[in-house]
């Protein structure tokens, strides 16, 4: 058509039919096929909705375009040819896209990609769960802290990445037929001691406890320096014979000879029994006190120091040696009057009484028990009447101000020793403040009528020597030749007669 025959006013998306009429382009429509009105417009026809007969087919969608339409595969699908669009159902080759194969890292760590029609999902591996903030990210489930309590109480739960184990606690083993690890594990205590699975040193004895074991020093052995007892790694040494020599600064041939013999006994101690060693020491002590020799020529105060050193050392040595004794009772006596009584017992809840010729001691067994020591307890008593030779002219120190008892009336007077001197010891060496009192009954020389009788103990002075004192000891009753004393600590004890009569009682001793 000649352009001169074409209407110039035809609207967008139309073309002229002649000089006065127009027609909408394919895919557009107006109120009539050919129109002459300049106000007419051509609207896009939406081929994707009725009454249009366009059908794209399954897994696809119709997409309207300006003046036309396209068929496109649904998300997650694509045409076999790889083309993006098609025109009708006959051209539809839409098929599902396998996103999991296409992108293996689609699901992050510990997740598995599962393809679905048109899409995919991520699934967490067993033992993992989605993080709330990222539904594609799987994180480990801690079964042990999640409150599920998946393990038997005889096991402990071990969380692994993606799983957990129920393993026997240390010192436990699976019951016969039970595995060790899965969630159906059930365990029982291992007796490491009887099964030989312990690692106790040969210097110790294995003690089984629920779930574990400890190693304790053998009787008469002690932990090596700096190593605690009752541990798996406890190592012990043979109970050393305490160092006991003349007190440095005191020079006496008799004393040196006594201590040389004691040192020899100490050296032989490993091969001798403790009982024989105790008897030998007592024999030497009895002979020393029977014939003190040049000890009696020492200054008085040095004699008191020697007595202190002897009493102190006896206690240490006998306490140490008694750890090696078996349960039972020992009684020894010697020509010069030295007596020794000792009882070894397992933990018992009763009183114990040790009887000697001139003295009796009664106390409760629990006083002898050393806290934390499961071994047998020891209660011992030594009577050393001969020690009185070294403890002549000893002052008595009063309680309130720790003053030597000397008032104007009795200036320089000293108390008189009535009884044997006895020394008491326990396996427990913490005896300065006993939880219950110890009762001593002394037989002694007759008391001069109206004289004050005192129960006293030998107090080791700051200078390593000593004096008689009454602190913590009370006189429960006295008859002519016997006195009952009650004390709340242990040491060496005796009964004294005060150097004044009852009428003139010194207030500091009441």
């Amino acid at each position: 058509q000649d352009s001169r025959d074409c209407a110039r006013w035809c609207p967008e998306n139309s073309s002229c039919v002649n000089a006065t009429a127009c027609r909408c382009n394919p895919g557009f429509s107006s109120s009539s096929e050919i129109f002459t009105s300049p106000t007419e417009i051509c609207d896009d026809i939406n081929e994707c909705v009725p009454p249009s007969k366009v059908s794209c087919g399954k897994s696809s969608d119709c997409r309207n375009t300006e003046g036309s339409y396209d068929c496109v595969c649904n998300p997650g699908y694509e045409l076999v040819s790889g083309a993006k669009t098609f025109k009708n159902e006959s051209e539809n080759t839409c098929q599902d896209v396998d996103e999991c194969q296409q992108n293996p890292r689609l699901c992050k760590s510990y997740g598995t990609c599962v393809n679905t029609l048109g899409s995919f999902t991520c699934q967490c591996l067993p033992g993992f769960k989605f993080k709330p903030e990222d539904p594609k990210l799987c994180t480990d489930v801690n079964e042990c802290t999640s409150g599920q309590n998946p393990c038997h109480s005889s096991t402990h739960c071990l969380n692994n990445v993606g799983s957990y184990q129920c393993r026997c606690r240390p010192g436990w083993q699976p019951i016969p037929g039970s595995p060790n690890g899965p969630n159906n594990t059930v365990c029982e205590d291992v007796d490491e001691c009887s099964s030989g699975l312990h690692q106790c040193d040969s210097s110790t004895i294995c003690f089984n406890t629920v779930g574990l074991y400890t190693c304790r020093c053998r009787p008469g052995w002690e932990p090596k320096h700096g190593i605690p007892n009752n541990q798996k790694d406890t190592v012990c040494k043979d109970m050393h014979f305490p160092t006991w020599t003349p007190p440095p600064g005191v020079h006496s041939q008799t004393l040196s000879q006594f201590f040389n013999k004691v040192q020899d006994l100490g050296r032989d101690f490993k091969t001798r029994s403790a009982k024989v060693t105790i008897q030998s020491i007592l024999k030497e002590l009895d002979e020393l006190l029977e014939a003190p020799g040049d000890l009696e020529t020492l200054p008085r105060f040095q004699q008191h120091c020697v007595a202190t050193h002897l009493l102190d050392g006896l206690e240490d040595v006998f306490r140490g040696l008694s750890k090696n004794l078996s349960i039972g009772l020992l009684n020894f006596s010697y020509p010069a009057g030295t007596e020794f009584s000792l009882e070894v017992q397992k933990q018992v809840d009763r009183n114990v009484t040790l009887r000697q010729n001139q003295a009796t001691m009664q106390l409760h067994w629990n006083l002898a028990q050393k806290s934390g020591d499961p071994g047998p307890s020891v209660v011992g008593l030594v009577s050393v009447p001969g020690m009185g030779k070294l403890l002549a002219e000893v002052p008595l120190v009063s309680e309130p101000e720790n003053q030597v008892v000397r008032n104007e009336t009795h200036q320089g007077l000293l108390p008189i020793l009535l009884s044997d001197i006895i020394s008491a010891f326990l396996s427990n060496n913490d005896t300065q403040n006993l939880s219950s009192p110890v009762t001593f009954t002394f037989s002694h020389r007759s008391v001069i009528p109206r004289q004050k009788v005192l129960c006293v103990f030998w107090e080791h002075g700051q200078n390593g020597c000593g004096h008689w004192a009454t602190t913590g000891c009370s006189t429960m009753g006295t008859r002519d030749t016997s006195t009952i004393c009650r004390c709340t600590h242990l040491s060496s004890f005796a009964v004294l007669m005060a150097p004044y009569d009852v009428q003139e009682e010194d207030p500091v001793l009441t």
Partner: antibody
Framework: EVKLVESGGGLVKPGGSLKLSCAAS????????MSWVRQTPEKRLEWVAT????????YYPDSVKGRFTFSRDNARNTLYLQMSSLRSEDTALYYC?????????????WGQGTSVTVSS | DIVMTQSQKFMSTSVGDRIIITCKAS??????VDWYQQKPGQSPKVLIS???NRHTGVPDRFTGSGSGTDFTLTISNVQSEDLADYFC?????????FGGGTKLEIK
């Protein structure tokens, strides 16, 4: 003024002998117990011997017993330590010291020391 | 033998401070323990005897205490001249035994 002066130290071969002396002045020498104490190169103090005031009692640790002899001459106010069968572990600075009255047996005065080296 | 253990080999303190040096005996020695001070290049000098008796001329800032197996030397208001080695000694039994010493350093 109490004074203790040691002498006689020196270099000696293992197995050799040496005699140390300690001259005392300024106190009643014959009334006091005396000791020798040595200080090892590692600065540890070790008691070597003690002699009673009259000289009739001597005491030694096992490490020197039978090898060392401690004596005194109260007329000359002098102590002597005869050392024989010397070993490398005897290398030390040797001090003489005075003991206070028993039972306070502290060593209240010390000399300046004499050095003994046992080496081949 | 009775072993005397001074567990602190070195101790550092400042002038004016208070410091406690300890000594442990392997068996009961009652109170027969002395403390000695040895300043650099000098002989040892007794400070404390019988666990708590201050020797003549020793300043009262030095205090000893203890009985049995555990002993302490306390220096209150430490002075620069207290820089020294400190040794404990037991004379309860032969052999007389010293602790290994504690070196006091002043910051």
């Amino acid at each position: 003024e109490v004074k203790l002066v040691e002498s006689g130290g020196g270099l000696v071969k293992p197995g050799g002998s040496l005699k140390l002396s300690c001259a005392a002045s300024g106190f009643a020498f014959s009334s006091y117990d005396m000791s020798w104490v040595r200080q090892t190169p590692e600065k540890r103090l070790e008691w070597v011997a003690t002699i009673s005031s009259g000289g009739n009692y001597t005491y030694y640790p096992d490490s020197v017993k039978g090898r060392f002899t401690f004596s005194r001459d109260n007329a000359r106010n002098t102590l002597y330590l005869q050392m024989s069968s010397l070993r490398s572990e005897d290398t030390a600075l040797y001090y003489c010291a005075r003991h206070y009255d028993y039972p306070d047996y502290a060593m209240d005065y010390w000399g300046q020391g004499t050095s003994v080296t046992v080496s081949s | 033998d009775i072993v005397m253990t001074q567990s602190q080999k070195f101790m550092s303190t400042s002038v004016g401070d208070r410091i406690i040096i300890t000594c442990k005996a392997s068996q009961n020695v009652r109170t027969t323990v002395d403390w000695y001070q040895q300043k650099p290049g000098q002989s040892p000098k007794v400070l404390i005897s019988l666990a708590s008796n201050r020797h003549t001329g020793v300043p009262d800032r030095f205090t000893g205490s203890g009985s049995g197996t555990d002993f302490t030397l306390t220096i209150s208001n430490v002075q620069s001249e207290d820089l020294a080695d400190y040794f404990c000694l037991q004379h309860r039994n032969y052999p007389l035994t010293f602790g290994g010493g504690t070196k006091l350093e002043i910051k």
